[in-house]
Interface confidence: medium
């Protein structure tokens, strides 16, 4: 589906970009934090049945995978790439795929990815060499 609208409008949620086209807000999986069975896999599905129309047109899809000695969780949200999330910059916010990058956090294993395609945080990838393969 084309990400830009061929008309400019004066609405906060159909914002004009520099070229005069209008960007619709993104569609992202948005289940906040949920327990996950995703572990030691090259890729995983979010198993989130909720899709959000993001609040603002520049927001992107984000997924955060965390593992500690108690559990594994997967967080799916919309977020503004200009702002940090959990204290980290959103890398690859323009990427069509959600490729996880490890972040240093005390007491847990922490991976985060961002992407800018419809529901792209539904399929999270831990190994870039497997980006064209099916989820395990």
């Amino acid at each position: 589906i084309p990400p830009h609208v061929p008309k400019s409008v004066n609405s906060d949620v159909m914002a004009s970009d520099n070229g005069g086209a209008v960007k619709l807000p993104q569609l992202c999986k948005f289940c906040d934090v949920r327990l996950s069975t995703c572990d030691n896999q090259k890729s995983c599905m979010s198993n989130c049945s909720i899709t959000a129309i993001c609040e603002k047109p520049h927001e992107v899809c984000v997924a955060v995978w965390r593992k500690n000695d108690k559990n594994i969780t997967l967080e799916t949200v919309c977020h503004d790439p200009k702002l940090t999330y959990h204290g980290f910059t959103l890398e690859d916010a323009a990427s069509p795929k959600c490729v996880m990058k490890e972040k240093k956090r005390a007491g847990e294993t922490f991976f985060m990815c961002a992407c800018n395609m419809e529901e792209c945080n539904d399929y999270i990838i831990f190994s870039e060499e497997y980006t064209t393969s099916s989820p395990d």
């Epitope: 409008v9 004066n10 159909m14 209008v22 899709t51 959000a52 129309i53 993001c54 609040e55």
Partner: nanobody
């Protein structure tokens, strides 16, 4: 509390027409861009159409351009989608939404969607 209630779906033959309505409450309707999205059986959500708060600007997915018309009546807090020349591939659950809407796919949610079935 935001509420969106879609209606107007049903069974229609290919080439036929339907008009969907969405009654909105719980927010300042005239200040919000509004959207129609759809979910075909076994598929993800797809943008259909969008309209600015004033109604002055509209967007249509390529797949519906020239066949569907989005409109709104801010005095009635109602969003519309006129669907003409319907095709089998238009069969889907249609949801109206505003930004921030969370659509729980496969389940009821506060805007429960309306099913459009195009079949002979």
């Amino acid at each position: 509390e935001v509420q969106l209630l879609e209606s107007g779906g049903g069974l229609v033959q290919p080439g036929g027409s339907l008009r969907l309505s969405c009654a909105a409450s719980g927010f300042t309707f005239g200040q919000e861009s509004m959207y129609w999205v759809r979910q075909a059986p076994g598929k993800g959500l797809e943008w259909v159409s969008a309209i600015s708060g004033s109604g002055g600007s509209t967007y249509y997915a390529d797949s519906v351009k020239g066949r569907f018309t989005i409109s709104r009546d801010n005095s009635k807090n109602t969003l519309y989608l006129q669907m003409n020349s319907l095709r089998a591939e238009d069969t889907a659950v249609y949801y109206c939404a505003k930004s921030g809407t969370r659509i729980k796919q496969g389940f009821d949610y506060w805007g429960q969607g309306t099913l459009v079935t195009v079949s002979s």
